[in-house]
Amino acid sequence: QRLSRAQQQLPLESLGWDIAELQLNHTGPQQDPRLYWQGGPALGRSFLHGPELDKGQLRIRRDGIYMVHIQVTLAICSSTSTSRHHHPTTLAVGICSPASRSISLLRLSFHQGCTIASQRLTPLARGDTLCTNLTGTLLPSRNTDETFFGVQWVRP
Amino acid sequence: QRLSRAQQQLPLESLGWDIAELQLNHTGPQQDPRLYWQGGPALGRSFLHGPELDKGQLRIRRDGIYMVHIQVTLAICSSTSTSRHHHPTTLAVGICSPASRSISLLRLSFHQGCTIASQRLTPLARGDTLCTNLTGTLLPSRNTDETFFGVQWVRP
Amino acid sequence: QRLSRAQQQLPLESLGWDIAELQLNHTGPQQDPRLYWQGGPALGRSFLHGPELDKGQLRIRRDGIYMVHIQVTLAICSSTSTSRHHHPTTLAVGICSPASRSISLLRLSFHQGCTIASQRLTPLARGDTLCTNLTGTLLPSRNTDETFFGVQWVRP
């Protein structure tokens, strides 16, 4: 058995096992740098167990320390396409609402690469909405093995 | 104490704590893009607690959501050696058997870099075998701090 | 409820949930390649729950398998600044004390990029001190969303 009898009688979410893995749905209109995400078994291997999506942005439902991870690959990309701009293509993950808690959590530039991938531990609170902002003139790949975003509750 | 008394009486695997961290054993013959892995304390800091190796490929023994991570560094590599090919050196992690569940989970190209590293959450089922395919004409480093592959069960 | 009643009566550290996320404090003097870290809520979103800092280096207080992760971004960096050196800028994470357990756990070179990020599972023992050595002539960014280092206890 995986869990003790007492634990098995509780729904998994009550154990604090909030978790989500999302795939890219679409980018925003030109003035909106946010990536819009989707998740659910009908879409493939993405899922939401606890957190929820609000207009394509991930909203946290349980306080705790989370492992946040992301990978973004640029579409039809070569080293020259990412290196030739004065302002390199950059990906930032942050809390975008509530406004009082707005902060950048994770930031990476592509420089001469076409993929960024990273992860970090960070405290998040119920109601925090995470935004992933991609600045630059290249589109992110929508292939589910190239671009994804997820969180995992790891500790109160 | 780390675990409650009830938990301490159960073997760790029964708690669902399946976990593995592998080091590179060797590459396949020329027509086989798969990397072959090995693990165990006698080899250094690699280990398998739950998952198992089948001819160098990692097989899952417990259903659940896993964090899969990988880092691969290319041997005697410079920016020029990875950037000059039409088809860049690429690493893909996927379920390769059973055939009915075959899918690419994680894919990265080296472009002008010599190391890729990423991680993602994905549902895996007992019997899934994960393959790591490296396409290109450069050898992966066998140094244990440069090339490694692991999984961690995080939730049913 | 997040935890069973029995679990709620134990301090979290007794469950083995040791975890830390650190931000860069400063680099060492010229002959010391180590990065010096700091953590705590007063500093922002960094924290130590279990592990401790010893002169800016992270010391483990509980045996187990840990997920170690790091991201380092170089300050005022472009592809040319990282690629033009014969000896590329390199980041290594290792156990630096006790000396008997000294080993490199994770190593990455920047090549033509300005950020490295990776993670791995590794067994660590109480008293292990982790050092992060940055070799090269470029400074690491102290922005908390660009440079960070963390560990998470995942299994005995």
Epitope: - | T73, A75, I76, T137, L138 | -
Partner: antibody, heavy 120, light 111 residues
Amino acid sequence: EVQLVQSGAEVKKPGSSVKVSCKASGDTFPRYNMHWVRQAPGQGLEWMGAIFPGTGETSYNQNFKGRVTLTADKSTSTAYMELSSLRSEDTAVYYCARNSYYDYAWFTYWGQGTLVTVSS
Amino acid sequence: DIVMTQSPDSLAVSLGERATINCRASKSVSSSGYSFMHWYQQKPGQPPKLLISLADNLESGVPDRFSGSGSGTDFTLTISSLQAEDVAVYYCQHSREFPPTFGQGTKLEIK
């Protein structure tokens, strides 16, 4: 099976140049480095340089002080080695060679060799 | 440049006996968990033939009486049971960095 077929023997005067060709069978020519190695009579092997036909990128042994020029014609899958300012000590068998798969300088496939004699 | 030094310069061994050729590099040719050392056989009037790559990897079609070993700076080519067709000159070569360099060769003859 990859085959490398080189041009025929040459006799050259000191101070002149020689251009040796190496035609590769198969369609993988642009993807692999082509190396040139020479061997003076009764002597050992000396690496001269390499070209990556896909881009024309070259790497040379500094011992030849700019006397060697490597080129490649993707359309004909042919690599060329030109050696200028010939002297008598350049008398040697010149080989083209390449790795079977990897992008490293060890040599699975060799041409049959081209004897270049430098004599006045 | 890395200098490769073979020993002996020549070697005479009886048929069926073991032949051992050594190669020393002026600095380590090991990197990334591999030894970038290779061995070739050359017979008169022919190009060299690759026998062993990466110190100990026997090439396809090469008899298993040939074996390679070593790491760092010191390497060995061994022929476990010498056959008449093994008479040739043997070369070691590194590919750790540019330029790759060869040993001076070892001439193997039958005693």
